[in-house]
């Protein structure tokens, strides 16, 4: 049994880091493998993660962490029974993938303005809470070419757009994702999408 693709890990900078790797053949990850992780610091404790299958030869493990600070460094040991398959380390602050925003809502009752709001996925005491910026994706269900991205570079989790920038009388979907420049994070996953019917009063043409 060998590791084909070494574990790579990302942290949500809150409580979970996710590590993925590939074995050289079909593997029952949860029965055959264990990922041990330990904070490199005084009197720390070794924890065991039981991986799950992620495709035939792929494994994924969700490492629980009580808190994360930028200096944290973890040792990682991948075991198959008594055999050490791989040894590495992981610094969560250098591999951050934020949590996805939630509760995306489209408010359509504001005089021909669409107000999109969503929730910051972090509690106020988390460092990332005040450092997230967002991308909002809006697309038409009828027209694949009608696909747009709005970058929200301010901290408020909301976006206002004129309803008239979209076509009237058709359905649209929106989703949102987050990233944090301070830790040069990757983008989060997209939030679940929300759907609405876009309609607004066309202004009378002036002749």
């Amino acid at each position: 049994m060998k590791v084909l693709q070494e574990p790579t890990c990302v942290s949500d900078y809150m409580s979970i880091s996710t590590c993925e790797w590939k074995m050289n053949g079909p593997t029952n990850c949860s029965t055959e493998l264990r990922l041990l992780y330990q904070l490199v610091f005084l009197l720390s404790e070794a924890h065991t993660c039981i991986p799950e299958n992620n495709g035939g030869a792929g494994c994924v493990c969700h490492l629980l962490m009580d808190d994360v600070v930028s200096a944290d460094n973890y040792t990682l040991d991948l075991w198959a029974g008594q055999q050490l398959l791989w040894k590495g380390s992981f610094k969560p602050s250098e591999h951050v993938k934020p949590r996805a925003p939630g509760n995306l809502t489209v408010h359509t009752n504001v005089s021909d303005t669409l107000l999109l709001t969503w929730s910051n996925p972090y509690p106020p005491d988390n460092y990332l809470y005040n450092h997230l910026t967002y991308a909002v994706n809006i697309w038409s269900e009828n027209d694949p070419a009608d696909f747009r991205i709005y970058n929200v570079t301010y901290l408020e989790p909301s976006l206002r757009i004129a309803a008239s920038t979209l076509k009237s009388g058709i359905s649209y979907r929106a989703r949102v994702r987050a990233w944090a420049q301070c830790y040069n994070t990757t983008w989060s996953e997209w939030s679940p999408s929300t759907k609405w019917h876009n309609s607004y009063r066309e202004p009378f043409e002036q002749h």
């Epitope: 904070l39 005084l42 009197l43 720390s44 404790e45 009580d66 808190d67 600070v69 200096a71």
Partner: antibody, heavy 119, light 107 residues
């Protein structure tokens, strides 16, 4: 809310030993470290050492190594510190402090045990 | 051992004031700087850990900042219940060491 209850005031003679306790209101000691800190008006706060009750690992300040012994009873979530060969310099308030394993800050403190060393 | 120095041993301020308490380490401590409050009855509480992180349940008027060797604790709007002695502590290098404390009093 985690609470730490320390044993009461001790009056001991020079050369003797003292053993104090600290009971933690946690479900399990596993995942925590218990540290001990000395406070005197002259020297301020000094870290004596820390113990991982789950696996028995310990770390001591060189200044107290050999005289301080940290132990724990996992069944009762109680930690102990024994200090031997006492002198008047050991008269102080001793605090226990609980922290998540591997962390360098002390979120939960006991109320302190006053030790007076006097003939 | 790393020496932690709180140059101001006592400080007088009025209720509502913004108060800053400083702490200097004898070498770089990589943000492993924590602040504690000790009340006159001996009760000790963690306020700030890892330079600027507010411990749960601590009022938001407390904040911390700094880097390298120089750190500070700020109380933005002093209240009567903040009368206490404040200690800094480094956790970067064994043994963890504490500052001598800054006693905060009301004018």
């Amino acid at each position: 809310q985690v609470q730490l209850q320390q044993s009461g005031t001790e009056l001991v003679k020079p050369g003797a030993s003292v053993k104090m306790s600290c009971k933690a209101s946690v479900n399990t000691f596993t995942g925590y470290n218990m540290h001990w800190i000395k406070q005197t008006p002259g020297q301020g706060l000094e870290w004596i050492g820390g113990l991982h009750p789950g696996n028995g690992d310990s770390s001591y300040n060189q200044k107290f190594k050999g005289r301080a012994t940290l132990t724990a009873d996992k069944s009762s979530n109680t930690a102990y510190m024994q200090l031997s060969s006492l002198t008047s310099e050991d008269s102080a308030v001793y605090y226990c402090a609980l922290t998540t394993a591997g962390r360098a800050w002390f979120p939960y403190w006991g109320q302190g045990t006053l030790v007076t060393v006097s003939a | 051992d790393i020496q932690m120095t709180q140059t101001t041993s006592s400080l007088s301020a009025s209720l509502g004031d913004r108060v800053t308490i400083s702490c200097r380490a004898s070498q770089d401590i990589s943000n492993y700087l924590n602040w504690y409050q000790q009340k006159p009855d001996g009760t000790v509480k963690l306020l700030i850990y890892y330079t600027s992180r507010l411990h749960s349940g601590v009022p938001s008027r407390f904040s911390g900042s700094g880097s390298g060797t120089d750190y500070s604790l700020t109380i933005s709007n002093l209240e009567q219940e903040d009368i206490a002695t404040y200690f800094c502590q480094q956790g970067n290098t064994l043994p963890p060491t504490f500052g001598g404390g800054t006693k905060l009093e009301i004018k």
